[in-house]
């Protein structure tokens, strides 16, 4: 066997950028705009195909939006010395379809990460934890924005996109300090069962504009700090007692439920009763029935138990085909 050809002989794939020439203190990468006073670098809509290696060490806010990065390899932001001040990183709309494990390693101050509007066909389970250890070093991330990261259908290959995202969120329990998580507009059909249990510090959770049909297997019990839960524009038909009790038990939460296709039948009775007495739901007077047809556009708060009936199930002997 012949050895792979490379100029490196030591540890493979130690992020090459880490050994790049250190940037000059006031250097600004080509195709970027820099403000040392604002600690900001903007490399926006420049069709960049890779993260610049010569980012200034003072950078606190880095905008890499509207590019053509495609791949974010391990150590994509690793530098020597490290970008110790980088706190906010916006990679939205940069045509990323592959984010590998350790992509955000060596960013000790990274508090906010926005990967929105990238067709993430592959998000490594270790994208945020950086390692495959069962318990990783805590990530410094406080805000993680993952709106509209669902890839086109031809890149989904019959696997669970929800599962892929969930695996990245729970790996190594690295995101225990996360306060804000936005997952809007991702075609989610369900929320994997154990995700929220691994994110106990969440204050703001946005799941709006997905395709969530039910929250039956989702537990909010651990989210004692949760202040805002956005569930607008999903496919929710009813919230069952277990979910209602959990939401009611959260001391600070405000829940947003607009524009869901509520089914106003006998299964809705408990939710209607709860809505009438809870202060948890914002804009609860706007919630209306979508089904059955006879109930369409009726306001949930105006319903009473007599309105909420289910068609009787005929015994088999009386059913007709």
């Amino acid at each position: 066997t012949s050895s792979a050809s490379s100029s490196s002989s030591s540890a493979p794939f130690l992020a090459s950028a880490a050994s790049a020439q250190p940037p000059l203190p006031d250097q600004c990468p080509a195709l970027c705009e820099c403000s040392e006073a604002a600690r900001t670098v903007k490399c926006v809509n420049r069709n960049l195909t890779e993260v610049p290696t010569d980012l200034p060490l003072y950078v606190r806010n880095l905008f890499l939006t509207g590019n053509q990065l495609a791949v974010l390899p391990a150590g994509a932001f690793a530098r020597r010395p490290p970008l110790a001040e980088l706190a906010a990183l916006n990679l939205s709309g940069s045509r990323l379809d592959e984010v590998r494990g350790g992509a955000f390693e060596h960013l000790p101050s990274l508090r906010q990460l926005d990967l929105s509007h990238n067709p993430l066909a592959y998000l490594s389970p270790f994208a945020f934890s950086g390692s495959n250890a069962s318990i990783s070093a805590p990530s410094p991330l406080v805000e993680l924005i993952l709106n509209h990261i669902v890839p086109p259908d031809d890149k989904r290959q019959n696997r669970s996109f929800e599962g892929m995202v969930a695996a990245a969120l729970v790996a190594g329990r690295a995101l225990q300090g996360l306060h804000l998580l936005e997952l809007a507009s991702n075609h989610f059909l369900y929320l994997p069962r154990d995700v929220l249990a691994q994110l106990p510090s969440l204050r703001y959770l946005d799941l709006s504009n997905n395709s969530l049909v039910s929250l039956t297997y989702v537990s909010f019990r651990n989210l004692t700090h949760l202040e805002s839960l956005h569930l607008e524009d999903n496919a929710l038909k009813v919230l069952h007692n277990g979910t209602l009790a959990e939401l009611q038990g959260l001391p600070h939460v405000r829940v947003f439920l607009d524009n869901n296709p509520w089914v106003c039948d006998c299964h809705m009775a408990d939710m209607v009763t709860w809505l009438k007495q809870t202060g948890v739901v914002q804009g609860k007077d706007r919630l209306t029935c979508a089904f059955p047809e006879k109930m369409r556009n009726r306001v949930l708060l105006e319903l009473n138990s007599a309105d909420l009936d289910c068609d009787p199930i005929l015994p088999p002997s009386l059913q007709t085909s």
Epitope: P12, Q68, P73, R100, K155
Partner: antibody
Amino acid sequence: EVQLVESGGGLVKPGGSLKLSCAASGFTFSDYGMHWVRQAPEKGLEWVGYISSGTYVVYYADTVKGRFTISRDNAKNTLFLQMTSLRSEDTAIYYCSTYGSNPFDYWGQGTTLTVSS
Amino acid sequence: QLVLTQSPAIMSASPGEKVTITCSATSSVSSMHWFQQKPVTSPKLWIYSTSNLASGVPTRFSGSGSGTSYSLTISRMEAEDAATYYCQQRSGYPPIFTFGSGTKLEIK
């Protein structure tokens, strides 16, 4: 030590098919994207295609799109290139290459494909 | 589609001579990678992201450039530097990875 070893090259008639393999060792194969690159006799380097670390992203050069298929078996640390409808202009040395921190960090030694009647 | 044109196609240099190889892109790119290939061997990553030397590359090599014009420079040519050098970048989405036409560098 990183090793990439290509195999499966040989002589094929025009219109025929062949599958190349690239056996990888010395690194965590499943963490890295992989390329195929070819070099026709006395010519320069030509990128053939790429497959992502998680196998869900594949790109091809226009010259091979619809004829070549890249796949990988992460359990066996192996990359594949299935070639069909082969033409004389596909004659080349075929290299596999890693996409670690940079697009072509490490290269194998190559395997030769000859398409001739 | 991006085309990378290298010049010269072939050149020879004496030991100790300064050598510059250029790579011109048909559209602006944010950086450039360079590869060295010696006869009957596979290519090696030589310079990445315009100016960073890959591990083990002698410091007499350097890279520079921006926009559509990039170059690889050898400050003092040595016999072991005789090889073909390729520039490389990618363009578009889905990405197309493009190599330059190559510059064959010979020792006098």
